[in-house]
């Protein structure tokens, strides 16, 4: 329904303090360079004008759109060109054209510091002093760094955090009270970060279809005992909240969200009989449990899905009459059957079936031609199934540290030309599916690798798309989303690159390592490894462990030194020209 | 949505010829391929011919082969059946389908072949 004053309508909906924080998550992705006390002066402005339209509706721009509202207000701030350069050249256009210009200019990597935590005293100090600022710095400065996250989520971890803070900061030994728990959190958000950004890639890439494909797979297996009609509507819906929230229509998004966590609960009966505890829960709860409930139990007698896809006369009748809802029904049937695999997989088979279709059923005789499809499937089955079993076969093997290794030289070997940055952060991230996927049972292994794999991707693909260097990737990028993973998978070592002459202050490191958090003692050490495989791209798993052994005993020696900037000035040189000697 | 509907049959002698059409619509034509179809009265349906998207490649039942040409107008969406030397047993309902199906989703048209 029609409402007059849309931003009256939202503020109503979704109450005071959901909608402060969305239109603060709005304005942080928008502009991410502005401060938290810029931003928080634009909110508190929208939010009383949105009161003044609430008490009126008639009253005097109340009845603009949220994005004439929002982008009049972002193109006031002072300043804006010296800051944001052209992202300013926004502000001469109109709507639609000016937030789709706005969406253009969010930037996937922005030069900002890492988010570090205040140390546990300090933090309780500003929480119980002002939770409501303490929670508004949080949601800016995770939503800048993450400029596509799904904002009601965001929405879901700020309350996350604030529950753990009110907790822990009510012990005695706050610092192990807040450490693990936080990491916890950080940890499931980022995941949440880059598996949100693929759904903005696919819908901004290859538009709302192929989004709806992959929500009509991903609840045909969370919702075995649902019909198609059912899952279509989800599907649908679904698609268009994530549709507004890629789309930085934050407000509508959160509110369509609500309604449809409140739609699947009062129809349970048809969707799902493992959603009652998620319905239980208050609203932000409610919807994170919904967005990961765990499957349904499959129906018993679910036939052969031949006797409809493949022996059935009417196949290409049925076809013929609407294909994408033939091609719905057969992922639904599919994806319904499968909850062991990936939604990738699932997606790649249905276009291997709409792609046999299209190949048989212009022939004299398709029955003949499509009655092996299924067959034909196989090898796409099995791809994936080995790749899992290798990776966890290796992870077990190897650890997180050592598996994540692995996966960096493997793939700095594949994509030489990418900055080492990129690839430290690639290999890390895709690293981890191992502690992630490796620990889950059988049947949860591949659809937790695969559809990880694929968003971690989907983000060096985008970092690529900034600066392209490498031919592989370009290649690898420019297919269709579900393809990705099995093109890098495929890749091999780039014979065209050049290797990089070696340089001695690239493995030259002092004192100050012996300091560092292990995780960044990680990262300086994985730097220099990808290093050594820029300058030897052919070197040896052998040649590299050696060197990479070496490195580590040198740093363990000269950590314990007594005078360790000596032990680094000597001992480092020679550690080079041993590294040097390693890989000759 | 799709529909079929087929033409040109009749009361015809022994020996005599008709030639069937069926306009299409609601679906890429040239993309699929295309049979005709007939059941005799108190029979099950029978296969008669079938021919490729591109019109290339054609198939016919051993009963009618060499008597028989099926042959479609991708530019004007219809599918014929050019019947020579008809024979009493060729009476049927003829019906066109959508890539081998048998099943009859179209009025069809009557060929009586009697002298």
């Known amino acids: 329904e029609a409402h007059k004053s849309e931003i009256a309508h939202r503020y109503n909906d979704l109450g005071e303090q959901h909608f402060k924080g969305l239109v603060l998550i709005a304005f942080s992705q928008y502009l991410q360079k502005c401060s938290y006390d810029e931003h928080a002066k634009l909110v508190q402005e929208v939010t009383d004008f949105a009161k003044t339209c609430v008490a009126d509706e008639s009253a005097a721009n109340c009845d603009k759109s949220l994005h004439t509202l929002f982008g009049d207000k972002l193109c006031a701030i002072p300043n804006l060109r010296e800051n944001y350069g052209e992202l300013a050249d926004c502000c001469t256009k109109q709507e639609p054209e000016r937030n789709e210009c706005f969406l253009q200019h969010k930037d996937d990597n922005p030069s900002l510091p890492p988010f570090e935590r205040p140390e546990a005293e300090a933090m309780c100090t500003s929480f119980k002093e002002n939770p409501t600022t303490f929670m508004g710095h949080y949601l800016h400065e995770v939503a800048r760094r993450h400029p596509y996250f799904y904002a009601p989520e965001l929405l879901y971890y700020a309350e996350q955090y604030n529950e753990i803070l009110t907790q822990c900061c009510a012990e005695a030994d706050k610092e192990s009270c807040l450490t693990p728990k936080l990491d916890g959190v950080k940890e499931k958000a980022l995941v949440s970060s880059v598996r949100q950004r693929m759904k903005c890639s696919s819908m901004q890439k290859f538009g709302e279809r192929a989004f709806k494909a992959w929500a009509v797979a991903r609840l045909s297996q969370t919702f075995p005992n649902a019909d198609f009609a059912e899952i279509t509507k989800l599907a649908t819906d679904l698609t268009k909240v994530n549709k507004e929230c890629c789309h930085g229509d934050l407000l509508e998004c959160a509110d369509d969200r609500a309604e449809l966590a409140k739609y699947m609960c009062e129809n349970q009966a048809t969707i799902s009989s493992k959603l009652q505890t998620c319905c239980d829960k208050p609203l932000l709860k409610k919807a994170h449990c919904l967005s990961e409930v765990e499957h349904d139990t499959m129906p018993a007698d679910l036939p052969a899905i031949a006797a409809d896809f493949v022996e059935d006369q009417e196949v290409c009748k049925n076809y013929a009459e609407a294909k994408d809802v033939f091609l719905g029904t057969f992922l639904y049937e599919y994806s319904r059957r499968h909850p062991d695999y990936s939604v990738s997989l699932l997606l790649r088979l249905a276009k291997k079936y709409e792609a046999t279709l299209e190949k048989c059923c212009a022939e004299a005789n398709p029955p003949a031609c499509y009655g092996t499809v299924l067959a034909e499937f196989q090898p796409l089955v099995e791809e994936p199934k080995n790749l899992v079993k290798t990776n966890c076969d290796l992870y077990e093997k190897l650890g997180e540290y050592g598996f994540q290794n692995a996966i960096l030289v493997r793939y700095t070997q594949k994509a030489p030309q990418v900055s080492t940055p990129t690839l430290v952060e690639a290999a890390r991230n895709l690293g981890r599916v191992g502690t992630k996927c490796c620990t889950l049972p059988e049947d949860q292994r591949l659809p937790c690798v695969e559809d990880y794999l694929s968003a971690i991707l989907n983000r060096v693909c985008l970092l690529h798309e900034k600066t392209p260097v490498s031919e592989h990737v370009t290649k690898c990028c420019s297919g269709s989303l579900v393809e990705r993973r099995p093109c890098f998978s495929a890749l091999t070592v780039d014979e065209t690159y050049v290797p990089k002459e070696f340089k001695a202050e690239t493995f030259t490191f002092h004192s100050d390592i012996c300091t560092l958090p292990e995780k960044e003692k990680q990262i300086k050490k994985q730097t220099a490894l990808a290093e050594l495989v820029k300058h030897k791209p052919k070197a040896t798993a052998e040649q590299l462990k050696t060197v990479m052994d070496d490195f580590a005993q040198f740093l363990d020696t000269c950590c314990k030194a007594a005078d360790k900037d000596t032990c680094f000035s000597t001992e480092g040189p020679n550690l080079v020209t041993r590294c040097k000697d390693a890989l000759a | 949505e799709v529909q079929l509907l087929e033409s040109g049959g009749g009361l015809v002698q022994p020996g005599g010829s008709l030639r069937l059409s069926c306009a299409a619509s609601?679906?890429?034509?040239?993309?699929?391929?295309m049979s005709w179809v007939r059941q005799a009265p108190g029979k099950g349906p029978e296969w008669v011919s079938s021919?490729?998207?591109?019109?290339?490649?054609?198939a016919y039942a051993d009963s009618v082969k060499g008597r028989f040409t099926i042959s479609r107008d991708n530019s004007k969406n219809t599918l014929y059946l050019q019947m020579n030397s008809l024979r009493p047993e060729d009476t049927a309902v003829y019906y066109c389908t959508i890539g081998g199906s048998l099943s009859r989703s179209s009025q069809g048209t009557l060929v009586t072949v009697s002298s």
């Open positions: 021919i490729s998207g591109s019109g290339s490649d054609t």
């Open positions: 609601g679906f890429t034509f040239r993309s699929f391929g």
